[in-house]
């Protein structure tokens, strides 16, 4: 015998209190698949969370973070504070990168500058808290008569057009 609940589409639930009739999900709940015996509670995007997509009877709400914070975790389950470039987030808040490290984003940790000498290259542009060093040609390439080297253009963040 076929389970009568299997006929209940997404957006409804199989109501045991009403002879297994397919009842619509009540407000603030959803079912994303058919044959459900209960509807799931909609996620609430409140406080630091903002609603990116409203809950419907067939799909959960989706959240993102209020300005100054960014999403962490699956489905933006947490919002972490942004820091400035040249900083990292610690348990005590945003702290400047230590000398010899950099962070070119508003999130994540400070990373060590590239060690140019490991690749047999020289430092063309010194590193800062916000930017990695730029490695130039190897010292041998800088001997008299070697062709001049054009330094690479500074990296741009994705999504930003040149000024």
């Amino acid at each position: 015998l076929q389970d009568p609940c299997s006929n209940c589409p997404a957006g409804t639930f199989c109501d045991n209190n009403r002879n297994q009739i397919c009842s619509p999900c009540p407000p603030n709940s959803f079912s994303s698949a058919g044959g459900q015996r209960t509807c799931d509670i909609c996620r609430q995007c409140k406080g630091v969370f903002r609603t990116r997509k409203e809950c419907s009877s067939t799909s959960n709400a989706e959240c993102d973070c209020t300005p100054g914070f960014h999403c962490l975790g699956a489905g933006c389950s947490m919002c972490e504070q942004d820091c400035k470039q040249g900083q990292e987030l610690t348990k005590k808040g945003c702290k400047d990168c230590c000398f010899g490290t950099f962070n070119d984003q508003k999130r994540g940790i400070c990373r060590p500058w590239t060690n140019c000498s490991l690749d047999g290259k020289s430092v063309l542009v010194n590193g800062t808290k916000e930017r990695d060093v730029v490695c130039g040609p190897s010292p041998a390439d800088l001997s008299p008569g070697a062709s001049s080297v054009t330094p690479p253009a500074p990296a741009r963040e994705p999504g930003h057009s040149p000024q």
């Epitope: 609430q44 409140k46 406080g47 969370f49 209020t66 947490m78």
Partner: antibody
């Protein structure tokens, strides 16, 4: 089992600053809202404000100019400061956990036992 | 003055069913789920109902909640003497960006 414990002076003089700390034990302070709620004698509950673990704050508009809530995740503590207090700030102050944002549904689900603060000279 | 409105008192006899109402506005109850709390004298409130009609584990099914429009209600069936307490409704208020509470209803079991 997460437990919350308020601490701070039970008597504050008018015009001074009320300072309370809530210590969270048995669980992490991360990924929740941490809330201060007060209850004047014989009256109902009033939200003072809340802080998200990563530093976002929101305060009751009627208290906003006087209140600061801060958090120290390394100590699993969050704190309330209420400036320029008057007798109207006399209340039981509860700290509480709120998991209403993110993937949480319950709202304010774990409460401290409450601490009585009297404003009097 | 509380943002949500509850009757200050309610009463019933053991075994009876009582309901407590809570009314708000479109920025709170009208747009967000309702929670109910129970507070015994000298203790912290305890979550009784969340998200309009959901019971946390350990809360007996004698307690039920419902919501319609900008109003909500808590029903207690099979009233018992230990149900004598203060009951508060709460909802998130979008304009205040935080929780708002009712003034509380003192339930007396006669």
């Amino acid at each position: 089992q997460v437990q919350l414990q308020e601490s701070g002076p039970g008597l504050v003089k008018p015009s001074e600053t009320l300072s309370l700390t809530c210590t969270v034990s048995g669980g992490s302070i991360s990924s929740y809202y941490w809330t201060w709620i007060r209850q004047p004698p014989g009256k109902g509950l009033e939200l003072v404000g809340y802080i998200y673990y990563s530093g976002y704050t929101s305060y009751n508009p009627s208290l906003k100019s006087r209140v600061t809530i801060s958090i120290d995740t390394s100590k699993n503590q969050f704190s309330l400061q209420l400036n320029s207090v008057t007798a109207a700030d006399t209340a039981v102050y509860f700290c509480a956990r709120d998991d209403y944002g993110g993937n949480g549904y319950y709202g304010v689900d774990v409460w401290g036992q409450g601490t009585t603060v009297t404003v009097s000279s | 003055q509380s943002v949500l409105t509850q009757p200050p008192s309610a009463s019933g006899t053991p075994g009876q069913r009582v309901t407590i109402s809570c009314s708000g506005s479109s920025s709170n109850i009208g747009n967000n789920p309702v929670n109910w709390y129970r507070q015994l004298p000298g203790t912290a409130p305890k979550l009784l109902i969340y998200s309009n009609n959901q019971r946390p584990s350990g809360v007996p099914d004698r307690f039920s909640g419902s919501k319609s429009g900008t109003s909500a209600s808590l029903a207690i069936s099979g009233l018992q003497s230990e149900d004598e307490a203060d009951y508060y409704c709460a909802a998130w208020d979008d304009s205040l960006n935080g929780w708002v509470f009712g003034g509380g209803t003192k339930l007396t079991v006669l």
